[in-house]
């Protein structure tokens, strides 16, 4: 399977909410011995290998924000901890998964990574990730709502096996 990032850049005004999205593509094994671990984290922009460094989002680590379920099942993060930080990650039946960030500030700007790990019991795991940039705008040049920029076809199938 692969991870696609429909949008490579999100430009949002301060105070707005945004939902960053990744999509699972390709055949997904729905067997009983397969589960999917999905999560989000921030990463440095200057890396040779994108998303190799895992930094917290609003002081929450990728472990705090993870979803763990089978196949194309729907799931949400536990509300209490994430929502106190203005965050919610979610996954639907169609392979889409997302993180919603509320009340954006300049400090939320940066590179965000989604990670999917396929875990097969007694077998090796398969990891893929996608990356996107969030730019929170202030002042006269800020849009009134979030503006999204589609990934190039090359970027949108942003598969990196770890």
């Amino acid at each position: 399977f692969k991870v696609a990032t429909p949008y490579s850049l999100y430009v949002c005004p301060e105070g707005q909410n945004v939902t960053l999205t990744c999509r699972l593509l390709g055949p997904v094994d729905k067997g009983h011995d397969v589960t999917f671990y999905k999560t989000w984290y921030r990463s440095s922009r200057g890396e040779v290998q994108t998303c190799s460094e895992r930094r917290p989002i609003r002081n929450l680590t990728f472990q705090d924000l993870h979803l763990h379920h089978g196949g194309h099942q729907a799931a949400n993060t536990s509300h209490d901890l994430a929502q106190r930080h203005g965050l919610e990650s979610a996954s639907d039946h169609h392979g889409n998964f997302s993180i919603t960030m509320r009340n954006l500030t300049l400090l939320d700007s940066g590179l965000y990574c989604c990670l999917v790990v396929e875990i097969r019991h007694h077998h090796s795991e398969h990891r893929v990730h996608g990356a996107m940039e969030l730019q929170v705008q202030t002042g006269k040049d800020a849009p009134s709502n979030c503006v999204v920029y589609p990934s190039s076809s090359q970027d949108s199938e942003n598969i990196t096996a770890a």
Partner: antibody
Framework: QVQLVQSGAEVKKPGASVKVSCKAS????????MHWVRQAPGQGLEWMGY????????GYNQKFKDRVTMTRDTSTSTVYMELSSLRSEDTAVYYC???????????????WGQGTTVTVSS | DIVMTQTPLSLSVTPGQPASISCRAS??????????MQWYLQKPGQPPQLLIY???NVESGVPDRFSGSGSGTDFTLKISRVEAEDVGVYYC?????????FGQGTKLEIK
Amino acid sequence: QVQLVQSGAEVKKPGASVKVSCKASGYTFTSYWMHWVRQAPGQGLEWMGYINPSTGYPGYNQKFKDRVTMTRDTSTSTVYMELSSLRSEDTAVYYCARSYYDYDGGAWFAYWGQGTTVTVSS
Amino acid sequence: DIVMTQTPLSLSVTPGQPASISCRASESVEYYGTSLMQWYLQKPGQPPQLLIYAASNVESGVPDRFSGSGSGTDFTLKISRVEAEDVGVYYCQQSRKVPSTFGQGTKLEIK
């Protein structure tokens, strides 16, 4: 090592514009936001705004409204700050300063340019 | 804008003695558990030098006699034993909200 080298001192008349440059070296230029801070003679520090060199998007202190423009040239790893409709109160040392982390827009600075003195006088 | 108020505005300290500077923000500078408050020292003719970031983190290369504390709206910079090289103007800065704002500065001199 990280270096931010600014252009030389300028003397301008009221109503004119000034464009100050800041050339970065010693790190990946597009990975860190660049901010501008000014300091009037004998006064404190005033944050003017920032530019994300990766995307070219700026953000400004509303105090400067339509007078300030920040741009960048990735081919030369240089950022620019242009201030228009100059008045005597704009006489100050103008500093570029690099954001601390390469993963957010946090406005705190371990690296500063040497400063550019802009004098506005008729 | 968040207003930063420093006290005192000037300070005269005997070498080897401690010094303390306070900074109060007009509203909280907390960002999901981190206090976005910095301290800088500016020496004459030089750009500011970062001493403390995120309220209590001492910047690399800064002597360990400098420390920062506080949360919410009230913050303190302490120098355990002042040395001659510590003279200059100290500024606090908040980076929680745009525009980032600085205190008016505290001038430290040696007795």
